[in-house]
């Protein structure tokens, strides 16, 4: 006669919390006489899940009528699945015996894993801003998903990135898993308006991945370019000094005017003009009266951007020889 086979067709069963799970098991022979029991796990500590003859299993129902004479289907349904139900389930044939039934053959087992969606990815940027051409790291985190298999991708402005490292924890069996990925992005001057996106794909999402984004504007500092120009006024004894601060980000900027080393004015950037790339421009004017100057004037403009060290730009205002003579006369 043919040797009894225990058939558990599903190797893996994915079930969401609260759902019912059907664990399939069929046998190929009615012999030897004896019951089929369900266990979770293996070894001495395996847990009895269902025994038709004895015990109380309120969440377990049989798919077929086990009392039927020629029944060969020993599948069971477990209701209201919780994370505690995860594990590998075995249907086990016992041979009728006394004083105990004797284990005869076990099925290969069906692993029940909880099907849980990953949380929305959270992307965090670097703790401090960096300037263009430097590399910054962005971290993406998602948790609470099961099974463990998951795909994570990074994009910058829709273009896929390749420089990233991903870890899924824990390494072993668990009720749920978490993912952490760190991407390295080289900053460009125009990245104020750029965005990085972390995209997570998982079997529970039915092909509709979850995304988390971060703006590079939070991570970048574009230092200003400085330009000083002077224009004589029509009156002749006044010079207009124009200080142009161009292409900077963020807006946080303070400008101090010094005349021969003495502070004459401090202002905080306001009424900025925004460029297409998201950087800002700002212009500051200083009107210098040259009529009461007898020596050359050193004008310094000091720019402090986003808490960084101040950058100085100086200009020497040369006083004409005629003015110098007049000044000399006045002192004698």
């Amino acid at each position: 006669e043919e040797e009894l086979q225990m058939i558990q067709p599903e190797k893996l069963l994915l079930v969401a919390v609260g759902e019912s799970a059907t664990l399939n098991c069929t046998v190929t022979s009615l012999l030897p006489v004896g019951p089929v029991l369900w266990f979770r796990g293996v070894g001495p500590g395996r847990e009895l899940i269902y025994n038709q003859k004895e015990g109380h299993f309120p969440r377990v129902t049989t798919v077929s009528d086990l009392t039927k004479r020629n029944n060969m289907d020993f599948s069971i349904r477990i209701s209201s699945i919780t994370p505690a139900d995860a594990g590998t389930y075995y249907c086990v044939k016992f041979r009728k015996g006394s004083p105990e039934n004797v284990e005869f053959k076990s099925g290969p087992g069906t692993e029940m894993a909880l099907r849980a969606k990953p949380s929305a990815p959270v992307v965090s940027g670097p703790a401090a801003r960096a300037t263009p051409e430097h590399t910054v790291s962005f971290t993406c985190k998602s948790h609470g998903f099961s099974p463990r298999d998951i795909t994570l991708k990074w994009f910058k402005n829709g273009n896929e990135l390749s420089d990233f490292q991903t870890n899924v924890d824990p390494a072993g069996q668990s009720v749920s898993y978490s993912i952490r990925s760190t991407a390295r992005v080289v900053l460009a001057p125009w990245d104020v308006r750029s965005q990085v996106t972390c995209e997570v794909a998982h079997v529970t999402l039915q092909g509709d991945p979850l995304r988390g984004t971060a703006n590079l504007s939070e991570a970048i500092r574009v230092p200003p370019t400085l330009e000083v120009t002077q224009q004589p006024m029509r009156a002749g004894n006044q010079v207009n000094i124009t200080y142009q601060v161009r292409n900077f980000y963020p807006q946080n900027l303070q400008l101090t005017w010094l005349e021969n080393g003495n502070v004459c004015r401090t202002e905080t950037a306001s009424t900025l003009t925004e460029n297409k790339d998201g950087t800002y421009n700002w212009t500051s004017w200083l009107l210098v009266n040259t009529s009461d100057q007898r020596d050359d004037v050193v004008l310094t403009c000091q720019v402090k951007h986003d808490g960084q060290l101040a950058v100085n730009k100086s200009l020497v205002l040369e006083v004409s020889a005629h003015q110098k003579d007049q000044s000399s006369d006045a002192t004698h």
């Epitope: 015996g97 006394s98 284990e103």
Partner: antibody, heavy 121, light 107 residues
Framework: QVQLVQSGAEVKKPGASVKVSCKAS????????VHWVRQAPGQGLEWMGR????????NTAQKFQGRVTMTRDTSTSTVYMELSSLRSEDTAVYYC??????????????WGQGTLVTVSS | DIQMTQSPSSLSASVGDRVTITCRAS??????LNWYQQKPGKAPKLLIY???SLESGVPSRFSGSGSGTDFTLTISSLQPEDFATYYC?????????FGPGTKVDIK
């Protein structure tokens, strides 16, 4: 052919432990429970307990609970019986025996050759 | 625990004799009874299981009968190799228990 080969004779002091091995061959090791039976010199047979080699689950006679540990190593098809806190009345021949797979009543169709354990100070 | 008793505790018989050994259980054990033969310095050997089923390879001169509390092992025609000690064993409940044995020797 089916064989159960046991480890050699042991002499132990009272209070010590002894571990007897029983190596199975000639059949699928995980398919038959293995029982342990002892026989004191000139006396009858006494059942000690059994192990399911597939799951590792055990059933021990109340008389020996807390003193007997039965284990198995499926990679070598070997079962072990360890008896602790030995006393002189534990001097006996210890047999491993395979549970038959035809009878309903638990019966032993193959036996090891026996291991003599002598407990003496 | 179920107690098993055997009678007689020993008997002397000749080759060719019909020998009967009885075994009694302290409570009903249905047909969950086995018989073993043991020779000096050897392990026991299964003869009869489930009260009356002959183990494979055992000569047909051995037979068993009974159910409930009273059981019998019969050797229809004693042979020289049958001189040994015979044990009954109940398998109705744990712990499994053996009878004290019946020694069959040469008259």
């Amino acid at each position: 052919q089916v064989q159960l080969v046991q480890s050699g004779a042991e002499v132990k002091k009272p209070g010590a432990s002894v571990k007897v091995s029983c190596k199975a061959s000639g059949y699928t090791f995980t398919r038959n429970y293995v029982h342990w039976v002892r026989q004191a010199p000139g006396q009858g047979l006494e059942w000690m307990g059994r192990i399911n080699p597939n799951s590792g689950g055990t059933n021990t006679a109340q008389k020996f609970q807390g003193r007997v540990t039965m284990t198995r190593d499926t990679s070598t098809s070997t079962v072990y019986m360890e008896l602790s806190s030995l006393r002189s009345e534990d001097t006996a021949v210890y047999y491993c025996a395979r549970l038959g797979d035809v009878a309903v009543a638990a019966s032993f169709d193959y036996w090891g050759q026996g291991t003599l354990v002598t407990v003496s100070s | 625990d179920i107690q098993m008793t055997q009678s007689p505790s020993s008997l002397s018989a000749s080759v060719g004799d019909r020998v009967t050994i009885t075994c009694r259980a302290s409570q009903s054990i249905s047909s969950y009874l086995n018989w073993y033969q043991q020779k000096p310095g050897k392990a026991p050997k299964l003869l009869i299981y489930d009260a009356s089923s002959l183990e494979s390879g055992v000569p047909s001169r051995f037979s068993g009968s009974g159910s409930g509390t009273d059981f019998t092992l019969t050797i229809s025609s004693l042979q020289p190799e049958d001189f040994a000690t015979y044990y009954c064993q109940q398998a109705n409940s744990f712990p499994l228990t053996f009878g004290p044995g019946t020694k069959v020797d040469i008259k």
